[in-house]
């Protein structure tokens, strides 16, 4: 239900940190964690209102 894999670069890291599928980058601890541990948007059924308009994920997100 959580948003899928993302690739992010840690604040002090020289290169992007790629998270494996089902993991997401935690900006506060600066490493990949299970996406379910972060309050990322849950997809809703078609027609249901979304809590926030989400743009398509950029590659680094």
């Amino acid at each position: 239900m959580r948003r899928g894999p993302r690739s992010l670069r840690g604040r002090d890291a020289p290169a992007p940190t790629a998270c494996v599928p089902a993991e997401c980058f935690d900006l506060l601890v600066r490493h990949c964690v299970a996406c379910g541990l972060l309050r990322t948007p849950r997809p809703k059924p078609a027609g249901a209102s979304s809590p926030a308009p989400r743009t398509a994920l950029q590659p680094q997100e």
Epitope: R11, L27, V29, L37, L38, R39, P51, A52, R54, Q58
Partner: antibody, heavy 118, light 113 residues
Framework: DVQLQESGPSLVKPSQTLSLTCSVT????????WNWIRKFPGNKLEYMGY???????YYNPSLKSRISITRDTSKNQFYLQLLSVTTEDTATYYC????????????WGAGTLVTVSS | DIVMTQTPLSLPVSLGDQASISCRSS???????????LHWYLQKPGQSPKLLIY???NRFSGVPDRFSGSGSGTDFTLKISRVEAEDLGVYFC??????????FGSGTKLEIK
């Protein structure tokens, strides 16, 4: 919908401990970061700290060793304790949830005004 | 900590006018992942802060299109194209790039002239 509600005493005496509870409904505090933020008279907002999905905490260094944030996952509540308060701790205290994609505070409690006075 | 400097502190406007609020950060808010985590909140009288704009220029759900955010690096602006009575309150910018701690601007009070 996720809802947060602060509760606790509205009046605390100087040198005593300020204790607040944030009750969360509609989401589990075992996911995400749960935060305390306060607003002083005059509109200044200060970030106080968080407790994370794992139970780890961060405290703003400006609060030195006076602050403690804990949680009770069985009640889906998290707590703020601020020791040795002074009149300068008079503020409206908010608990807030953090969006884990864009890292903004997406849900806030209504806030509770705490006055420190003898 | 990142210092967020907001100007003006008070902004008297007439209904229908345009309003502009500036926010400057003490360091660039471009994260090494390429994103800029600069957000704007509005706190109406008697309410808690509510998100208006996230990541510089993205309107949150339900926010009217008269609100727009722009900027990059250290300089950011919130514009309200036609101020309505319901827009009155205190506006805060906030950064989530160099965290923790999250930091906020000093607030801009939008009021009727």
């Amino acid at each position: 919908d996720v809802q947060l509600q602060e509760s606790g005493p509205s009046l605390v005496k100087p040198s005593q401990t300020l204790s607040l509870t944030c009750s969360v409904t509609g989401d589990s505090i075992t996911s995400g970061y749960w935060n305390w933020i306060r607003k002083f008279p005059g509109n200044k907002l200060e970030y106080m700290g968080y407790i994370s999905y794992s139970g780890s905490t961060y405290y703003n260094p400006s609060l030195k060793s006076r602050i403690s944030i804990t949680r009770d996952t069985s009640k889906n509540q998290f707590y703020l304790q601020l020791l040795s308060v002074t009149t300068e701790d008079t503020a409206t205290y908010y608990c807030a949830g953090l969006d884990g994609l864009y890292w903004y505070f997406d849900v806030w409690g209504a806030g509770t005004l705490v006055t420190v006075s003898s | 900590d990142i210092v967020m400097t907001q100007t003006p502190l008070s902004l008297p406007v007439s209904l229908g006018d345009q309003a502009s609020i500036s926010c400057r950060s003490s360091q660039s808010l471009v994260h090494s992942n390429g994103n800029t985590y600069l957000h704007w909140y509005l706190q109406k009288p008697g309410q808690s802060p509510k998100l208006l704009i996230y990541k510089v220029s993205n309107r949150f759900s339900g926010v009217p299109d008269r609100f727009s955010g722009s900027g990059s690096g250290t300089d950011f602006t919130l514009k309200i194209s036609r101020v309505e009575a319901e827009d009155l309150g205190v506006y805060f910018c906030s950064q989530s790039t160099h965290v923790p701690p999250f930091t906020f601007g000093s607030g801009t009070k939008l009021e009727i002239k």
